[in-house]
Amino acid sequence: PHLRTFTDRFQTCKVQGAWPLIDNNYLNVQVTNTPVLPGSAATATSKLTIIFKNFQECVDQKVYQAEMDELPAAFVDGSKNGGDKHGANSLKITEKVSGQHVEIQAKYIGTTIVVRQVGRYLTFAVRMPEEVVNAVEDWDSQGLYLCLRGCPLNQQIDFQAFHTNAEGTGARRLAAASPAPTAPETFPYETAVAKCKEKLPVEDLYYQACVFDLLTTGDVNFTLAAYYALEDVKMLHSNKDKLHLYERTRDLPG
Amino acid sequence: CKILKCNSEFWSATSGSHAPASDDTPEFCAALRSYALCTRRTARTCRGDLAYHSAVHGIEDLMSQHNCSKDGPTSQPRLRTLPPAGDSQERSDSPEICHYEKSFHKHSATPNYTHCGLFGD
């Protein structure tokens, strides 16, 4: 999946299996990524687990779990708030669009989480105070989570180089160079560009991610995934000058 | 005013049960510098607070007492404390600590928010 870190680095990661997205004193978010096509290096998120840790008079420990084709509007115990404590309403799940869009507000830690199902896969977005982001007891282990450190270098796909490459190639050459060797050849570059431009008129990294995803999978749902990811940034990012990220040299992991 | 948070972090960093910075080690000076930094960060919201002024004077006192230089390494807090509370409430029966923005930032600017997102392939 494509990852935008807390420090506004943008990466495309091929991480497979379960990885920690966030792991701090209040919250643990784990994602499971699976290959989008057999033999493909590109992966997308098929499962998401969020653990809200027990916190003082506010919330009991609550677990939220979403999987492909299952985006519940409740915690695994069936509740929609933080439990029986006085401040239970400082943690709330709201269903925005049934089966497609859920928002979790954790007011006790100033945090908003948006989970969506777009096509077969899940997207995740969070707004969190820096103090909560950095509330990590053991930096050696907890500090390794993806939202903070990004993906390990050996798990990154240089999709910007792929994109530059794609502009000068036909679909046949592209499919061979693609991280998804079995990607359909019926999806020309021009079509991918047109589809992405429709939803993402600014040629930023979200637009480029969209093009990459269409060329890699042939699945037009990924256009919507990039579109909603940017919409979530607009809603959740505090710096409106940083909504769009643009091409730059590839980052080393933090 | 977050002065109690600064105090608690300093007490925690320099007290006995966690391999402390004893009062004649470089770690003690580092803990003092961290404490001074913490008090500076909260200064704007602590004007007129006696506990704050007591902390500032106490730091100066200990700095000179232990020959600590103002510059030098600071210590990392051993354990980040939980988001602090002020005296606003989300609703009448909800403890004030359960509303991060209202309670913590009642006296200061809004917190620095960060964003992380994951999507697509």
Epitope: Q56, E57 | C1, K2, I3, L4, K5, N7, S8, F10, W11, S12, T14, S15, G16, S17, H18, P20, S22, D23, D24, L32, Y35, C46, D49, L50, A51, Y52, S54, A55, H57, G58, I59, D61, L62, T81, L82, P83, P84, A85, G86, D87, P95, I97
Partner: antibody
């Protein structure tokens, strides 16, 4: 004037719970911790724990863990100490004390004490 | 059994000096700036007399002084007066615990 005023004496049966209040005035409540200390008849002082009214963080004496709960209400500048599963050896005067300011940890202002008698 | 050890009692005549010791470990006393002393008269709440080993809060007479040597902190009352007859407790903050001494009864003969 800085003051801590505690609730009145209580008589409780074994197994019951007691909740003692401690109302602070004359200072910024969230800038000082509150410690709770008890003293059995004819005995020394026994530290029970402390709470930060600022963050809600608590630190309880190990031997009371699971039985003691300390809370604060910053809207009324009041600290509370609740002790459950009372036994006869919990009969004591319970004091709240303000934790001093600045780099030094000490208890500079004390409540008048609340006598809790546990008797069947 | 208290974590900090104090003598059960000490006594002196008016005008004399008495010293109360408070012995702990290196972490609870030896390396700590968190040793304080409290006076308690019968039926009353304790009163802070010294903090940070040697510092006197305002309102405490200067005949009360503190010192520390190794893992032992001491409170000295010089020029003992009748109103100094009381129990005295030392405490030390040791991170996850606040440690009290068992208390020392000071008697003015």
């Amino acid at each position: 004037e800085v003051q801590l005023v505690q609730s009145g004496a209580e008589v409780k049966k074994p197994g019951a719970s007691v909740k003692v209040s401690c109302k602070a005035s004359g200072y910024t409540f969230t800038s000082h911790g509150i410690s709770w200390v008890r003293q059995a008849p004819g005995q020394g002082l026994d530290w029970m724990g402390w709470i930060s009214p600022y963050s809600g963080n608590t630190n309880y004496a190990q031997k009371l863990q699971g039985r003691v709960t300390m809370t604060t209400d910053t809207s009324t500048s009041t600290a509370y100490m609740e002790l459950s599963s009372l036994r006869s050896e919990d009969t004591a005067v319970y004091y709240c004390a303000r934790v001093g300011s600045g780099p030094y940890y000490y208890m500079d202002v004390w409540g008048q004490g609340t006598l809790v008698t546990v008797s069947s | 059994q208290s974590a900090l050890t104090q003598p059960r009692s000490v006594s002196g005549s008016p005008g004399q000096s008495v010293t109360i010791s408070c012995t702990g470990t290196s972490s609870s006393v030896g390396d700590s700036i968190y040793v304080s002393w409290y006076q308690q008269h019968p039926g009353k709440a304790p009163k802070l007399m010294l903090y940070d080993v040697t510092k006197r809060p305002s309102g405490v007479p200067d005949r009360f002084s503190g010192s520390k040597s190794g893992n032992t902190a001491s409170l000295t009352i010089s020029g003992l007066q009748a109103e100094d007859e009381a129990d005295y407790y030392c405490i030390s903050y040791a991170g996850t615990d606040t440690l009290f001494g068992g208390g020392t009864k000071v008697t003015v003969l």
